[in-house]
Interface confidence: medium
Amino acid sequence: AYGPGETLCGGELVDTLQFVCSDRGFYFSRPSSRANRRSRGIVEECCFRSCDLALLETYCATPAKSE
């Protein structure tokens, strides 16, 4: 969903996380059990460099289950 070099920062990052994770909520840093690069948070990964939808979704809370 991103072009090369595009980044998400500040309010746009929060806005987009609220949208992508709308059914779950989100974290600014991944829970340690799910972290691949534990020293990094979403700001570093998506604002300081470009990130993609798959990476954004790793910051969503536990996936929702339908009833």
Epitope: Y2, E12, D15, S22, G25, A64, K65
Partner: antibody, heavy 115, light 105 residues
Framework: QVELVESGGGLVQPGGSLRLSCAAS????????MSWVRQAPGKGLEWVSY????????GYADSVKGRFTISRDNSKNTLYLQMNSLRAEDTAVYYC????????WGQGTLVTVSS | DIVLTQPPSVSGAPGQRVTISCTGS????????VHWYQQLPGTAPKLLIY???KRPSGVPDRFSGSKSGTSASLAITGLQSEDEADYYC?????FGGGTKLTVLG
């Protein structure tokens, strides 16, 4: 006051293309994410696509992924939806809606896909 | 996939109170804000309630929203003929199936 005006709908054959526009006024356009939401005749609302306020992120419903492209021109206060490879099931009224809460909607533009 | 379930239809007489439910799983309705939209016949949807219970300016206080557990509800008191419409709940990009409100008489 906030106003969203869609245009570009019409009759198109299956496999064809259309480009919808949504002209915005009455608010700070570049501060709001925007979405397209559609409603098939006699049916409920279905979110189609989203674009963040600077255009850095775009998202799509599975039903249109790979066929539709959302974009925005922040110098013209205009939102677009390029629709390719149209199918009969894409027939609907298409609305543009503001923000993540969809707090304002346009009047809609009808897209009919039929041979 | 997330599913938000609404009754297809509800009805009430003028002046009565009606409620419309929106049911989902604890991980969506229980965690996230629910919004409600009103769609009068032949018109575009309009935001009626946002963030579970907040009313945008211009929406009468006859309309109220609440959330408890895995359900959200829209209540309309002092029902009027002009309230006859379709009502949708949503969690951002996911909409319920809609409820048609009929005002009797």
């Amino acid at each position: 006051q906030v106003e969203l005006v869609e245009s570009g709908g019409g009759l198109v054959q299956p496999g064809g293309s259309l480009r919808l526009s949504c002209a915005a006024s009455g608010f700070t356009w570049s501060s709001f994410a925007m979405s397209w939401v559609r409603q098939a005749p006699g049916k409920g609302l279905e979110w189609v696509s989203y674009i963040s306020y600077l255009g850095s992120y775009t998202g799509y419903a599975d039903s249109v992924k790979g066929r539709f492209t959302i974009s925005r021109d922040n110098s013209k206060n205009t939102l677009y939806l390029q629709m390719n490879s149209l199918r009969a099931e894409d027939t609907a009224v298409y609305y543009c809606a503001r923000g993540t809460k969809f707090d304002y909607w346009g009047q809609g533009t009808l897209v009919t896909v039929s041979s | 996939d997330i599913v938000l379930t609404q009754p297809p239809s509800v009805s009430g007489a003028p002046g009565q109170r009606v409620t419309i439910s929106c049911t989902g799983s604890s991980s969506n309705i229980g965690t996230y804000d629910v919004h409600w939209y009103q769609q009068l016949p032949g018109t575009a949807p309009k935001l009626l309630i946002y963030s579970n219970s907040k009313r945008p300016s211009g929406v009468p206080d006859r309309f109220s929203g609440s959330k408890s557990g895995t359900s959200a509800s829209l209540a309309i008191t002092g029902l009027q003929s002009e309230d006859e419409a379709d009502y949708y709940c949503s969690i951002t990009r996911v909409f319920g199936g809609g409820t048609k409100l009929t005002v009797l008489g």
